[in-house]
Interface confidence: medium
């Protein structure tokens, strides 16, 4: 089945992140202005910003929300994300990307310094 | 060949719980992302949730509570239980996989055939 770009829904838009920890970013959007209604869930990707050839992360959840924590991500790290709206044959272009850093990991306890 | 086939469906009870098995053949399960939906009568398609290559589940927030997505890598199989079902939960139950967007926008991909769920007394 190919389905025709007409019918596919419009990338979602507004997307953007919010540094929540040094291991989670908030994300959220605004549902797709066109064919939203046939949305069956949206595709969060993510990956790290710097170097070559890193691995790209996907997690898909469902039409009911526009936001997402992704919680499981490295310390004072560049994350580049970008959503996708899924339909039952088909999938909307990508939205656009936004690149959003964690924060640094914090120690539990300050150093010990012996003199 | 590339095959989905869900097994399970059937009359439950309200307050009852199912239990779905989807078997894969021709690609492998657990190196994909896995998902079930669902299509009540007269109504569109429903994302229930999925399970990815690394074995973490995510579920639709609403059916979050009673629903587990699970995997039995050596049978290639992926299941779905659902527990305090109500008349609402009945629909025809499908497991599909939904490829990375890398793969391209435009992909017809694997749908199994569905398995009919009614809950009823």
């Known amino acids: 089945t190919v389905v025709m770009s007409e019918d596919r829904p419009s990338a979602p838009y507004n997307v953007h992140a919010e540094t929540m920890s040094s291991s989670a970013i908030l994300l959220a959007w605004e549902r797709p202005l066109y064919n939203s209604d046939k949305v069956i869930a949206y595709s969060v990707h993510y990956m790290k910003a710097e170097g070559l050839n890193n691995e790209e992360y996907q997690v898909v959840i469902g039409n009911d929300t526009t936001h997402y924590i992704i919680d499981d991500l490295e310390p004072a790290s560049n994350y580049t994300f970008y959503i996708v709206a899924y339909m039952p044959m088909g999938a909307s272009q990508m939205s656009d990307h936004v690149t959003q850093n964690t924060l640094e990991d914090v120690p539990l306890r300050p150093p010990e310094i012996s003199l | 060949e590339v095959q989905l086939v869900e097994s399970g469906g059937g009359l439950v009870q309200p307050g009852g719980s199912l239990r779905l098995s989807c078997k894969a053949s021709g690609f492998t399960v657990s190196s994909n992302y896995m998902h079930w939906v669902r299509q009540a009568p007269g109504k569109g398609l429903e994302w229930i949730g999925g399970?990815?290559?690394?074995?973490?589940?995510n579920y639709k927030s609403s059916l979050k509570s009673r629903v587990t997505i699970s995997r039995d890598n050596s049978k290639n199989t992926l299941y779905l239980q659902m527990n305090s079902l109500r008349a609402e939960d009945t629909a025809v139950y499908y497991c599909?996989?939904?490829?990375?967007?890398?793969?391209?926008?435009?992909?017809?991909?694997?749908w199994g055939q569905g398995t009919l769920v009614t809950v009823s007394s």
């Open positions: 599909a996989r939904l490829p990375p967007s890398r793969d391209g926008y435009n992909y017809a991909d694997y």
């Open positions: 399970i990815n290559h690394s074995g973490r589940t």
